[in-house]
Structure formats: C-alpha cells, structure tokens
C-alpha cells in the first residue's frame, strides 16, 4: 500500500506548507480532533477534511493557500482499515471535537496523519516493504 503511505506523507507536507501561511488564514475556530480513539482515525480525518479552513484573501499568498487547502480535501487511496472504520457508528461527530484556531488545527491534523502512518507501518511486516 505504498500509494496510501505516499498520500499521507504528502498531506503532512501540505499541512507544513500551510503552517507557513497561518497568519493569512481566516482566524476561525474549527473542530480539531485530538487523542483520537483507536478505529476512529478515518472518521477524525474526514472531520479535518470537512473543516472550513479559508484564506483571509490578503497579500499575494492567496493562490498557494487556496491550492493547498484544496489538495488537503482530496480523497486519499482507501485501505482495508479505512473501509472497515467507515462502518463504525460509535465515533464522535465532528461537532463534538474541541474547536481550535488554524495554527492548532493544522498541528492536530499533522499529528493524526503521523499516527495513521505509524499504524499503517505497524500493520505491515517489519522491513519487508520498499521504502
């Protein structure tokens, strides 16, 4: 499932890019899942994707910000774990998560992505995959 891993890693890079422009984002509070319970990662991931992160339309960074936000919302390649989790009805709703400003929102999104990469690697035989 290298494509899945690449996609997750790319999302982290896009989040890091957006963190450079945090002062150019609308300072709105957004649902930001943290300490997500096991098997609710994909549900939390979709909460991050649904959040209305927006450019403040100031300065000349508007285009790169909008493109980055759009790329964050792209559907990643699905995995067996993701397909299984989509059927769970017990995960918290997006609205139930604490709302945070863009800086913390992006940091929490990155943490979730890192957790998902770690889980993905842990579910595979150690050392058997090509980087």
């Amino acid at each position: 499932q290298d494509r899945h891993m690449i996609r997750m890693r790319q999302l982290i890079d896009i989040v890091d890019q957006l963190k450079n422009y945090v002062n150019d984002l609308v300072p709105e509070f957004l649902p930001a899942p943290e300490d997500v319970e096991t098997n609710c990662e994909w549900s939390a991931f979709s909460c991050f994707q649904k959040a209305q992160l927006k450019s403040a339309n100031t300065g000349n960074n508007e285009r790169i910000i909008n493109v980055s936000i759009k790329k964050l919302k792209r559907k990643p390649p699905s995995t067996n774990a993701g397909r299984r989790q989509k059927h769970r009805l017990t995960c918290p709703s997006c609205d139930s998560y604490e709302k945070k400003p863009p800086k913390e929102f992006l940091e929490r999104f990155k943490s979730l992505l890192q957790k998902m990469i770690h889980q993905h690697l842990s579910s595979r035989t150690h050392g058997s995959e090509d980087s």
Partner: antibody, heavy 117, light 106 residues
C-alpha cells in the same frame, strides 16, 4: 527499472539563471512527486524543495523562495529546476530525487552547476 | 527549522569493525529519520528509512535505531564497499540533512 537522468554540466556567470532537467522512466511519472537537493563541493546535502508531478504544486525551502522555480512536463516525464540570480555559493551538484513513501528512494546522477565570472 | 547534527564528522575504521554514527535533531522528530550512503562522485543511496527499516537490497549489517532527538546508524561488520559518507535526514517537517560522517580506511 526506475531511472532519473539529468541534464549535463553548466557554467554560468553571477546574476544569470540555470535550468536543470531530470527525465524519469521506469514508473508512472505523475504517481510520484519529485525533490531537488543540492550539494556544494565538499559539503553536505541541502533540500531545495519538491514538486507534485501531477499538477505542478510546489513546496520550496524558504531559503530559496523567490529564486527557485520547479516545473514539469508530463508529455516527456521531465521535471525542471530553475535557479535565478546565481552567485558563487550556488556552485554545486544538483540532484533530483523521487519522493518515495517515506524517503527519497531513487536519485538522478547529479548536474554540476559552476557559477564563475 | 529543524537542525540535524551528526557525529563524528569523520572516523577511521578497519574491515570487520563495528561502526556507530549518531545523529541528533534540534527538536523531537519521532521516528521520521532516514539514512543515506554516498560515495565520491556518486548520488546518495537510501539505506534506512523511518529510523530502522532497511531499504530493499541493503545488507542486514546496516541497522538503525533511536526515537525523538537521538538516532544511531550501526554497521555491524564493516566491509570494503562501506567506506563512504553517511547522511541522516529528518522528514518530520519538510526535509533537512545532517552534515555527514565520512567513514575512512584506517
């Protein structure tokens, strides 16, 4: 097999620009992003940035922002790195490297760019 | 920016020796660390990714360990083809390389 073949050595004057190419083969070009890394003579490696080969989205090292431009041509499976306002400190070997799942898994052979008056 | 510091910058060793190279990050990078080998006039080659995972085709005498800020690359029994420069690289936040460690023949 995966291959990244770069353009030949260049000699440039200070203030000029250079455009280095990197032709990919052996895999689906738009499935993998590409990094650019440089190495000054006798020095370590320095990450310059990356490009999404499917849509030209770029992320640059802040150090090079405003001077570096990364582009791609899907018809020839080639990525380009252009560096402008060259100075002597830009003398280096420039590498393209494929964005693997968690690492730069394949590298080009490198292109030496010499900046000298 | 995350800084990566490698030590030593160079070392002399003999064939069969056990060699250890360390890499320290200026902040916590979890397991987001890779190791590359570079020989003179050649491009770097990936050895180890995600701290301890061997890239395909890399001999098992190479191993990596660590977490957080301190990492180690170990060559259990140095072979003639292992004399080269080794670089660590973080990918927790974008990418940064260490300064390199040159492994020379004693």
């Amino acid at each position: 097999q995966v291959q990244l073949v770069q353009s030949g050595a260049e000699v440039k004057k200070p203030g000029a620009s250079v455009k280095v190419s990197c032709k990919a083969s052996g895999y689906t070009f738009t499935d993998y992003w590409m990094h650019w890394v440089r190495q000054a003579p006798g020095q370590g490696l320095e990450w310059m940035g990356l490009i999404d080969t499917s849509d030209s989205y770029t992320i640059y090292n802040q150090k090079f922002k405003g001077r570096v431009t990364m582009t791609r041509d899907t018809s020839t499976s080639t990525v380009y790195m252009e560096l402008s306002s060259l100075r002597s400190e830009d003398t280096a070997v420039y590498y393209c490297a494929r964005y693997g799942p968690l690492a730069m898994d394949y590298w080009g052979q490198g292109t030496l760019v010499t900046v000298s008056s | 920016d995350i800084q990566m510091t490698q030590s030593p910058s160079s070392l002399s060793a003999s064939v069969g020796d056990r060699v250890t190279i360390t890499c320290r990050a200026s902040q916590d990078i979890s397991n987001y660390l890779n190791w590359y080998q570079q020989k003179p006039g050649k491009a770097p080659k990936l050895l180890i990714y995600y701290t301890s995972r061997l890239h395909s085709g890399v001999p098992s005498r190479f191993s990596g360990s660590g977490s957080g800020t301190d990492f180690t690359l170990t060559i259990s029994s140095l072979q003639p083809e292992d004399f080269a420069t080794y670089y660590c690289q973080q990918f927790n936040t974008l990418r940064t390389f260490g300064g390199g460690t040159k492994v020379e023949i004693k």
